[in-house]
């Protein structure tokens, strides 16, 4: 089956959600781990990640179509210490498949705002830190 990983971000008030989404077939969930790394160009692994999610096969989902699983990493207030390069990754212990998402970056600016760049589609986001709004 076709398995892929995408990265996205959303903002709720001051909170920034970094989201890793893996698309996979239902039967491929078992043994899959999704993880998010920061500033690790070569050695991104579940062991060195900021957060990881081990997928389980959900018997409640009917059919064999493609399903998605999400890892969400929430930062309550973005600070200069969060600036850096992030990457969503996944791997399967069963099949040996390794997925690496595109690198994306958080940049905290001198004005106290921050931007998230490198996300696919229309996912270049600029956030006003103080206002908590999408600008």
């Amino acid at each position: 089956g076709c398995i892929n990983i995408t990265s996205s971000a959303s903002q709720e008030g001051t909170r920034l959600n970094l989201i890793c989404t893996v698309w996979h077939k239902k039967e491929e969930a078992e043994g899959f781990v999704v993880f998010l790394c920061k500033d690790r160009s070569g050695d991104c692994s579940p062991e060195t990640s900021l957060k990881q999610l081990r997928l389980k096969r959900d018997p409640g989902i009917d059919g064999v179509g493609e399903i998605s699983s999400q890892l969400m990493f929430t930062i309550s207030q973005v600070t200069p210490l969060h600036s850096g390069t992030y990457q969503c990754c996944a791997r399967s212990q069963k099949s040996g498949i390794r997925l690496q998402g595109h690198f994306f970056s958080i940049l905290f600016t001198e004005t106290g705002n921050y931007t998230v760049t490198g996300l696919k589609q229309r996912q270049h986001l600029e956030f006003s830190h103080n206002e908590g709004t999408l600008s």
């Epitope: 008030g13 060195t48 990640s49 900021l50 309550s76 207030q77 200069p80 210490l81 600036s83 106290g112």
Partner: antibody
Framework: EVQLVESGGGLVQPGRSLKLSCAAS????????MAWVRQAPTKGLEWVAS????????YYRDSVKGRFTISRDNAKNTQYLHIDGLRSEDTATYYC????????????WGQGASVTVSS | EIILTQSPTTMTASPGEKVTITCRAS?????MHWYQQKPGASPKPWIY???KLASGVPDRFSGSGSGTSYSLTINNMEAEDAATYYC??????????FGAGTKLELK
């Protein structure tokens, strides 16, 4: 179990320099920003400096800029605070602390290193 | 720089009493964190993001507030709660600031 152990404190004469160390264990040190927070005798807590996870970006409270240098060695799981030109007002217990990644709280603290500046 | 003013500076409470410690910010802040410190010990995170209890904190503690006014409440004071409590916030560019502390003693 997370452990932060400070060392390098002691009695120092005004104008001298001092280097504090903080040895970390029990977590992936290279993933976390680190900080120093100090507490003068019988006084409250005061944030001093922070360093990002990679060590390339450092931040200081205004009153210590230019005299204090925070750094880290991820290979040794250790962070440092170098203080130049020590003053009597630098007398304090210096705590090593970890920055929680998802929040702005300091979630783990060392036992503290006592620094006394006196002639 | 945002200044955090805690009140009262010191207080005494009897076992079973309800205790409220307040922290006022000179400008609006998004979250407040609270730490407990006992003599000779390091501070411990006690309440984070205004209302979330840190691991191991008894549920007689609670936190609330928004904007410039935040509080820590103990519903039934116990002997082990005697300590100094500090509030803390983050904002840019002054970064991390603490209140001066509230010393809570057992009557």
């Amino acid at each position: 179990e997370v452990q932060l152990v400070e060392s390098g404190g002691g009695l120092v004469q005004p104008g001298r320099s001092l280097k504090l160390s903080c040895a970390a264990s029990g977590f992936i040190f290279g993933n976390y920003a680190m900080a120093w927070v100090r507490q003068a005798p019988t006084k409250g807590l005061e944030w001093v400096a922070s360093v990002n996870s990679g060590g390339g970006n450092t931040y200081y409270r205004d009153s210590v800029k230019g005299r204090f240098t925070i750094s880290r060695d991820n290979a040794k799981n250790t962070q440092y605070l170098h203080i130049d030109g020590l003053r009597s007002e630098d007398t304090a217990t210096y705590y090593c602390a970890t920055h929680n990644y998802e929040s702005t709280v300091f979630d783990y603290w060392g036992q503290g290193a006592s620094v006394t500046v006196s002639s | 720089e945002i200044i955090l003013t805690q009140s009262p500076t010191t207080m005494t409470a009897s076992p079973g009493e309800k205790v409220t410690i307040t922290c006022r910010a000179s400008s609006s802040v998004s979250y407040m964190h609270w730490y407990q410190q006992k003599p000779g010990a390091s501070p411990k995170p006690w309440i984070y993001e205004t209302s979330k209890l840190a691991s191991g904190v008894p549920d007689r503690f609670s936190g609330s507030g928004s904007g410039t006014s935040y509080s820590l409440t103990i519903n039934n004071m116990e002997a082990e709660d005697a300590a100094t409590y500090y509030c803390q916030q983050w904002n840019y560019p002054s970064m991390y600031t603490f209140g001066a502390g509230t010393k809570l003693e057992l009557k």
